[in-house]
């Protein structure tokens, strides 16, 4: 969380930022918060991007004005227009690309003053993984898919009954580049598996850590999913 | 869940002056914007003014200022409305407001305004 | 002041009827349009923020829409419970200002 002022006593506004991660090619939010007017025509909402020149985006006099918007994000940004008035000045990010990464400066003006915060924004590829038995291999094995991630994550398996114990060799990752060349499909199989017991596959990067839970008795099977993004701190 | 619970009905002699009560709950309430609003008997809704607790940011409508006065006790999560000077077209339900949106409005208070 | 004016002043329309008010802004306001539903006796509620967000909870049969001066509110069926008054209001400059009102009836 960062906590950003304006300059000077009465004259500052509090503006708070979110860092956050965005999946690329799926849509992003970049999260700013300010002190609310009770009027929408003294709000300027500016959205600023390290080493772009352009704005990313502009909102002011209860409009977007887009006329120095930046190339790079021309038809991909949009605030949320009924949540001004009420001190959000979170930005939609469309298709998010590998180069929206950067520092971002959340820029406020309002009736009773200024306020900016900046705000880092990381960019990669992460999805859910599923666990399933595989009925196609010799023995007992798990096998553990990802359709997309960026960078290439680690991939660790754990289970409930050996808590502590080292799988790695009993293991077998591989990383195979999908069509745009950028993400990649996660594909880890685990062997010698037995039954009545959970096995947790963890999937994790610099952006986001997902995890893919299976149950496997005699009777059943149980699978969960859980994905949690690491650096969403505020400022 | 949100709630603005008002204080019950007064009745005023003209020249008095009366002060309105608005309890916040559910909400952060430094937080937000609380508005004033009347409605006299057959009359449109009339903005009076607005109140930033966390500032004590305050914004009337020149039609009431010099007679409404906005305050907060933060400490209590209350807003308060007085409007001094009453005369007769005063008569009117007054209602608080949260935020800018007028998102949740409490109950209403009648004030009657009569010799 | 902005002033806000709200045709018709009342209704009355069939259950299932599409109902449409429309509001006019003396000047420019963007999209800073409010619609609250008043019932008799009680406090108004938020139905669409600027111009054609329904707020939390609100039927889809209520719309809204417009720019500028010239704003719409819709109800696409209406329903007995929507027996009431609407009124209009502008948050784009202070002082907010509200609509005179339409009260809905059913024939």
């Known amino acids: 969380l960062i906590i950003g002022f304006g300059i000077s006593g009465r004259h500052s506004i509090t503006v708070t930022t979110v860092a956050s991660a965005g999946n690329i090619g799926e849509d992003g939010i970049l999260s700013c918060t300010f002190e609310p007017d009770i009027k929408l025509s003294d709000i300027v909402i500016q959205w600023l991007k390290e080493g772009v020149l352009g704005l990313v985006h502009e909102f002011k006099e209860g409009k977007d004005e887009l006329s120095e918007q930046d190339e790079m994000f021309r038809g991909r940004t949009a605030v949320f227009a009924d949540q001004v008035i009420v001190g959000n000045a979170s930005l939609r990010l469309k298709n998010v690309q590998l180069t929206d990464a950067g520092t971002y400066k959340c820029y406020i003006i309002t009736s009773k003053g200024k306020g900016n915060a900046n705000l880092e924004y990381k960019t990669g590829a992460f999805s859910m993984p599923e666990v399933n038995v595989d009925y196609n291999a010799s023995s007992e094995t798990l096998r553990c898919e990802a359709p997309r991630w960026f960078p290439q994550p680690t991939v660790v398996w754990a289970s409930q009954v050996d808590q502590g114990a080292n799988f790695s060799e009993v293991s077998n990752t591989s990383f195979e580049l999908n069509s745009e060349n950028v993400t990649m499909k996660v594909v880890s199989v685990l062997y010698n598996v037995t039954i009545n017991n959970t096995y947790s596959c963890m999937i994790e990067n610099d952006i986001a850590k997902a995890t893919g839970d299976i149950k496997v008795t005699e009777s059943e099977i149980k699978r969960r999913s859980h994905l949690q993004l690491l650096n969403s701190k505020a400022s | 869940e949100v709630q603005l619970v008002q204080s019950g009905a007064e009745v005023k002699k003209p020249g008095a002056s009366v002060k309105v009560s608005c309890k916040a709950s559910?909400?952060?309430?430094?937080?937000?914007?609380m508005n004033w609003v009347r409605q006299a008997p057959g009359q449109r809704l009339e903005w009076m003014g607005g109140i930033y607790p966390n500032r004590g940011n305050i914004e009337y409508n020149e039609k009431f200022k010099g007679r409404v006065t906005l305050t907060v006790d933060t400490s209590a999560s209350t807003a308060y409305m007085e409007l001094s000077s009453l005369r007769s077209e005063d008569t009117a339900v007054y209602y608080c407001a949260r935020d800018s949106r007028f998102s949740y409005w409490g109950q209403g208070t009648l004030v009657t305004v009569s010799s | 002041d902005i002033q806000m004016t709200q045709s018709p002043s009342s209704l009355s329309a069939s259950v299932g009827d599409r109902v449409t008010i429309t509001c006019k802004a003396s000047q420019d306001v963007r999209t800073a349009v409010a619609w609250y539903q008043q019932k008799p006796g009680k406090a108004p509620k938020l139905l669409i923020s600027?111009?054609?967000y329904r707020y939390t909870g609100v039927p889809s049969r209520f719309s809204g829409s417009g720019s500028g001066t010239d704003f719409t509110f819709t109800i696409s069926s209406l329903q007995p419970e929507d027996i009431a008054t609407y009124y209009c209001?502008?948050?784009?400059?202070?002082?907010?200002?509200f609509g005179g009102g339409t009260k809905v009836e059913i024939k």
């Open positions: 559910g909400y952060t309430f430094t937080s937000s914007w």
């Open positions: 209001q502008q948050h784009y400059s202070t002082p907010l200002t």
């Open positions: 600027s111009t054609s």
